[in-house]
Interface confidence: medium
């Protein structure tokens, strides 16, 4: 998938735009809002009726190198008695994010944008049909 | 992708850190073949902590459209289909990376930006704080 060009109806390309070789784009990986943090203090992953665990995946050739993935703990959902209710299902909620992939080709390096699917947490749902046909 | 020569010491010297600015291919590699979007597309309706999706559009960003979840209720939906206020619907938030056009309006020059999005909602047991 290609990144769309800026629509001509919205903007004219400013003179200040840096020159870029054809088929590529310039990317500054100094992150805007780098210090923004999600509050993890509420530990909703343990208090949810569809609780989950976190695992960190690490890849030195990816930027950012650390990506956190959630994993639902159970198949069913936890009821008020703390027991697993198997008429309900814990399902993963997923979100796409961008990463930069570094590729080594001999003595050269290339960079590629990549979409990564991150499991963010889990929610409790009712199956559409409860039983096998 | 665009190939950039490595240090003269190649192959012995290895750059551990990413350079501040890189040239990347305009094509985005999409590796997520593992999920079926149709399956999860209606979780927002069938969850015990249902949510609405709000469109956030910004032509200076890629992706230009991001969907934000807003929990429909304070409580959670019980087995009878009623809202149970002993439980709480809370948003699940995630930091994601997007591309911001920099300088503004430039077609092929971007900077990574971290944004906080609410992806969906989950039902939690409240931490009870009694008023003294």
């Amino acid at each position: 998938r290609k990144i769309p060009k800026v629509g001509h109806t919205f903007f004219q390309k400013p003179e200040s735009c840096p020159p870029v070789p054809g088929g590529s784009m310039k990317l500054d990986i100094g992150i805007i809002n780098e210090n923004q943090r999600v509050s993890m203090s509420r530990n909703i992953e343990s208090r949810s009726t569809s609780p989950w665990n976190y695992t960190v995946t690490w890849d030195p050739n990816r930027y950012p190198s650390e990506v956190v993935q959630a994993q639902c703990r159970n198949l069913g959902c936890i009821n008020a008695q703390g027991k697993e209710d198997i008429s309900m299902n814990s399902v993963p909620i997923q979100q796409e994010t961008l990463v930069v992939r570094r590729k080594h080709q001999g003595c050269s390096v290339s960079f590629q944008l990549e979409k990564v699917l991150v499991t963010v947490g889990c929610t409790c749902v009712t199956p559409v049909i409860h039983h096998v046909q | 992708g665009i190939t950039i020569p490595r240090n003269p010491g190649c192959p012995n010297s290895e750059d551990k850190n990413f350079p501040r600015t890189v040239m990347v291919n305009l094509n985005i590699h999409n590796r997520n073949t593992n999920t079926n979007p149709k399956r999860s597309s209606d979780y927002y309706n069938r969850s015990t902590s249902p949510w609405n999706l709000h469109r956030n559009e910004d032509p200076e960003r890629y992706p230009s459209v991001i969907w934000e979840a807003k929990c429909r209720h304070l409580g959670c939906i019980n087995a009878d289909g009623n809202v149970d206020y002993h439980m709480n619907s809370v948003p699940i938030q995630q930091e994601i990376l997007v591309l911001r056009r920099e300088p503004p309006h430039c077609p092929n020059s971007f900077r990574l930006e971290k944004i906080l999005v609410s992806v969906g909602c989950t039902c939690v047991t409240p931490i009870v704080h009694h008023v003294a």
């Epitope: 665990n53 159970n74 198949l75 499991t119 409860h130 | -």
Partner: antibody, heavy 123, light 106 residues
């Protein structure tokens, strides 16, 4: 068509461990849960637990917590069930069985079964 | 855990007979499944949701019941019905099965 092919019979000594595999084909492995059921000689079927390859979610029967460990290798479309600290009462036929997808059907709906793997624990 | 008790544990009947197997749950359940396991074979889903016939199952099989008492009926016994029959509930965690009813031909 859906097929679940389990690994062959195993004979183990008490205290040892055994890992039974279940190779799935004919459907998208990630989209359905996989359950394990024990059938000891002359005994009723016993549900041991199930795992969701997509979310990583696992549910165990309390009777098998600490005894059985369920895992998957999604790249190989294979589910595994490992039994530890084997005792004579673990001698049984172990079945893998496909459950629902959590979307159209409940995770706990079992439809297709593997052919079974006999595990014999004997000194 | 919900305990499932089947009766009888074994029975012998003649071809063409009407056969009834009952399953009693230790507490109320919403749905019951029934499985058939032929000698040396894998269990096969026969009835789901108490009364619904699984795909490819002959219409001589039927299921009924509610609450704690459920029944599997074979309206006209055939030689190929020789098997052990299990009831199973999935109302409550964990899934539990009855001890089985072994059906033989006289």
């Amino acid at each position: 068509q859906v097929q679940l092919v389990q690994s062959g019979a195993e004979v183990k000594k008490p205290g040892a461990s055994v890992k039974v595999s279940c190779k799935a084909s004919g459907y998208t492995f990630n989209e359905y849960t996989m359950h394990w059921v024990k059938q000891a000689p002359g005994q009723r079927l016993e549900w041991m637990g199930g795992i969701n390859p997509n979310s990583g979610g696992v549910s165990y029967n309390q009777n098998f917590k600490g005894k059985a460990t369920l895992t998957v290798d999604t790249s190989a479309s294979t589910a595994y069930m490992e039994l530890s600290s084997l005792r004579s009462e673990d001698t049984a036929v172990y079945y893998c069985a496909r459950g629902g997808d959590g979307y159209y059907t409940n995770y706990f709906d079992i439809d297709y079964w593997g052919q079974g793997t006999t595990v014999t624990v004997s000194s | 855990d919900i305990q499932m008790t089947q009766s009888p544990s074994s029975l012998s009947a003649s071809v063409g007979d009407r056969v009834t197997i009952t399953c009693s749950a230790s507490s109320s359940v919403n749905y019951m499944h029934w499985y058939q396991q032929k000698p040396g074979k894998v269990p096969k889903l026969l009835i789901y949701d108490t009364s619904k016939l699984a795909s490819g199952v002959p219409s001589r099989f039927s299921g009924s019941g509610s609450g704690t008492d459920f029944t599997l009926t074979i309206s006209s016994l055939q030689p190929e019905d020789v098997a052990t029959y299990y009831c199973q509930q999935w109302n409550s965690h964990p899934l539990t099965f009855g001890q089985g009813t072994k059906l033989e031909i006289k």
